[in-house]
């Protein structure tokens, strides 16, 4: 019967008595930077070309005995997970292996850099179809390794890496912390994060998604027909590299940004038990388990968005945090979150010709996060309209006044330390969907976009007194682009998007002694693109 | 995932006012920085990736590497250029004493220097 991990990533329509989804990634080449591999293992023979690249440190210890099967173990298994005949994800993908890890599974940042450079030079000498680079390794945070990954990604290569097996924040490791890399954590058959001895999968905002990574059956270097079960974030990353190969084989023109958005979109949502993660990391860690798309084509009509969290600002009075979208993505909204509730909101601002989301800490606050909603919106023209604090009136308002521009997100930023001490009622006029409304002492920022066929609507859900969390979701066919809270008073900790749901967090009424006039409303802006939908229908 | 992220150490070695002879002074006001792995057991002191500014050509990378070797030799230090990078990042990999870091950070075109470190199969 089909191994659990292949079943988990397979949409129901492909599940027969065996795993054989259409097109096994045959147009794609997957580079594997790992140990040496047994390339003539029955599972992978003819699928893996061993390059002559080798850059590894000496093995530790004077009595180290180099046993071929041990030297090849890690790489052979991963090659099998990516493209193995019987237990592989992308059975049609061809692979090239580079040896950057020694027989003890140890390598160097410099050796990995030289390997990445080798791939880039190979790509220039002999351009082929789409390239996926699998990096099933991790070291401490490395500016240079992250920079090299960024350059390779900007050259059109998809990089997939292991989040790390240290039960720690993936942002402390490289290449896991590189924004351009698709970073993969590991889950088990019960959709629990994988425990590995006393440690386990890494987590946090630098993880893009999770994938099967425990008891994964794959090629064993012990013999040419042997299989073995291995666990780790390397195995998880290999699944995503395989899925990426299949997606790129079906749609070779996909950019890295489009591929990442699709991986997120087609993932199983909210199936991971978050209690395993440290409390402060739960909100930052994506609750996504990778899966193949239900059909290899036809996803183009959707408006894809993802949530990007910034690093923590730190606690100083003027501290700020910045969340950025990828180069091909549009920032459609910006929100902020602080565990202490002491924050001074957020704003969208231009930086290097691109909009970024900046959140502001407040005096006495433990720090803030900026949360960007990053979307794929072809031919978009977006701008930010700002209204300064209204002071005397009921509230500050700003709307999208340009013809054909629609509101995709609202942000508010204030200079006063605590809006909670100024409590005028905030009225939200009905029938004006293109308008952002906020506190009279806050400046309000509206993200206004023009794109072919783009339409948006506002959805609200309010509760009389704060109960920790208010949510509002966009319905089927619509995509959440903006998430904010009304009003911006002190008991609101912030707002953020989780998949297609806008979450507004606030302090419990029991701890704040709030009154019912402090009703908290979650405001979602839901958009869709008629243009993308029509283009997709014309293709079919 | 941010580049400015990470619990890693950044040591900025201040440039001395006196120049080193051969080396042209770096652009005014820019200070090359030194980075090393925050996890001590994973550090590999003695091998360094010297990363040069983005538009640096291969010939300039090679010239900078030779210059470092010459200046190190004058101080009685042996250095070995292990690899010259081009194609992804401009720079070079050098085996040298950590005593030479201050000197290396003053070289023209240098953006930052990172001490080599270990990576592991996951």
């Amino acid at each position: 019967s089909i191994p659990w991990n292949l079943e988990r990533i397979t949409p129901p329509r492909y599940r027969a008595d065996e795993y054989q989804p259409p097109d096994g990634g045959s147009l794609v080449e997957v580079y594997l930077l790992d140990t040496s591999i047994q390339s003539d293992h029955r599972e992978i023979e003819g699928r893996v070309m061993v390059t002559d690249f080798e850059n590894v440190p000496e093995e530790d210890g004077t009595r180290f005995h180099r046993q071929a099967s041990k030297c090849d173990s890690h790489g052979t298994h991963l090659a099998g997970v990516v493209s193995g005949r019987d237990a592989g994800v992308a059975k049609g993908a061809s692979m090239r292996s580079l040896r950057v890890l020694n027989c003890q599974g140890k390598g160097t940042v410099s050796g990995t850099l030289i390997g990445l450079e080798f791939i880039r030079k190979s790509q220039l000498v002999q351009p082929v179809g789409p390239l996926v680079v699998l990096l099933p390794l991790a070291g401490g945070y490395s500016r240079v390794l992250n920079a090299a990954c960024q350059r390779l990604a900007r050259a059109g290569v998809v990089l997939v890496t292991a989040a790390g097996n240290f039960r720690d924040d993936a942002c402390l490791y490289s290449p896991a912390s590189a924004p351009e890399v698709i970073t993969v954590g590991a889950t088990n058959a019960q959709d629990q994060p994988v425990t590995l001895g006393t440690l386990g999968t890494n987590f946090g905002r630098c993880v893009d998604l999770f994938a099967p990574g425990e008891d994964i059956i794959g090629a064993s270097s012990d013999c040419s027909t042997c299989f073995v079960s291995q666990s780790g974030t390397s195995q998880a990353a290999a699944h995503v590299a395989g899925i990426a190969a299949m997606m790129l084989s079906a749609e070779p023109e996909l950019t890295l940004a489009e591929l990442r958005q699709r991986l997120i979109h087609f993932s199983a949502k909210d199936v991971i038990n978050e209690a395993w993660f440290p409390e402060d990391q739960r909100v930052l860690t994506p609750n996504l388990v990778a899966a193949l798309p239900p059909s290899t084509h036809g996803a183009g009509w959707q408006l894809f968005c993802r949530t990007v969290w910034s690093a923590h600002s730190g606690p100083t009075r003027m501290a700020t945090a910045i969340a950025r979208c990828a180069p091909d993505e549009e920032l459609l909204s910006c929100s902020s979150f602080s565990r202490s509730g002491k924050r001074r909101g957020e704003r969208m601002e231009a930086q290097g010709g691109k909009l970024v989301c900046r959140a502001h800490n407040a005096f006495g606050g433990e720090g803030v996060y900026a949360i960007a909603r990053c979307c794929l919106l072809p031919q978009a023209n977006c701008s930010v309209h700002t209204a300064p604090p209204a002071e005397a009136s009921m509230g500050t308002r700003v709307h999208c006044h340009q013809q054909g521009h629609v509101l995709t997100g609202c942000s508010s930023h204030w200079e006063v330390e605590d809006l909670g001490t100024h409590k005028p009622p905030v009225l939200r006029p009905r029938g004006q969907p293109n308008q952002c409304v906020g506190h009279r002492e806050a400046s309000i920022h509206a993200s206004c976009c023009h794109a072919p066929g783009l339409e948006c609507k506002v959805k609200e859900h309010g509760i009389p007194a704060p109960q920790g969390q208010v949510t509002v979701a966009c319905e089927e066919g619509w995509t959440l682009t903006g998430c904010s809270a009304l009003p911006g008073t002190s008991h609101v900790l912030g707002a953020y998007a989780v998949d297609n749901t806008c979450v507004v967090r606030s302090r419990d009424v029991s701890t704040t002694g709030s009154t019912s006039e402090e009703a908290v409303t979650a405001v979602a802006i839901c958009c869709r693109s008629r243009h993308l939908a029509q283009a997709s229908q014309e293709l079919q | 995932q941010e580049d400015e992220d990470g619990d890693y150490e950044e040591l900025v070695l201040a440039l001395r006012s006196e120049e080193d002879g051969l080396a042209e002074a770096p652009e005014h006001g820019t200070t090359a920085t030194f980075h090393r792995c925050a996890k001590d057991p994973w550090r590999l002191p003695g091998t360094y990736v010297v990363v040069l500014k983005e538009e640096t050509h291969l010939s300039q990378s090679e010239r900078t590497a030779r210059r470092l070797q010459a200046q190190a030799a004058r101080r009685g230090y042996l250095t070995k250029i292990l690899h010259v990078f081009h194609g992804l990042l401009p720079g070079f990999l050098v085996k040298m004493s950590g005593d030479l870091l201050e000197l290396a950070l003053k070289l023209p075109h240098v953006d930052y220097i990172e001490e080599d470190s270990s990576v592991f199969a996951q």
Epitope: Q38, E45, D86, S224 | -
Partner: antibody, heavy 115, light 109 residues
Amino acid sequence: QVQLVQSGAEVKKPGASVKVSCKASGYSFTSYGISWVRQAPGQGLEWMGWVSAYNGNTNYAQKFQGRVTMTTDTSTSTAYMELRSLRSDDTAVYYCARGYVMDVWGQGTTVTVSS
Amino acid sequence: QSALTQPASVFGSPGQSITISCTGTSSDVGAYNSVSWYQQHPGKAPKRMIYEVSNRPSGVSNRFSGSKSGNTASLTISGLQAEDEADYYCSSYTSTNMVFGGGTKLTVL
């Protein structure tokens, strides 16, 4: 193009040994093993075993265990199959094929065992 | 390792379709995707026609197709032509080895 070229026909006495060679060209020799398959006159195909061109490991069919030795020489991209203690029922055409996938075959070597 | 079971002979007229079955067990055909089909003309080496159940190597006519259900694999040849007359063998991985079918002689009438 990918080719496997085998050595010429052999006539052997019962109890003797035969060593058949198979020279590979047109691909990376160590990326595949070599399978050996035989076919007795008027009979079907019979898989004898496999040898790794990467590390020399072997996987023999139980029937030939102890009587067959398969080796490779990566310097010449050549695989060898030696069958010992020959009997008359070992008379067959012996084929080498690329890997377990057996996507490319040699032209065959006829081995006749006769007293 | 006992051979996979194939019919000894199959007959078909030009233009017709024929199917050759290959029955194994849950330890070979049923367990692996790696079922191949070979064509052998008299005095010639076998030629791979289908691999991994249903994939056709480049250069092989699309008249040849493969499938699998449970422990039985099948080779279908549509639009029979005179040059299709040959012996056909299936093969499958087993947990440690390879196993062939006994062979099927296809006669084009």
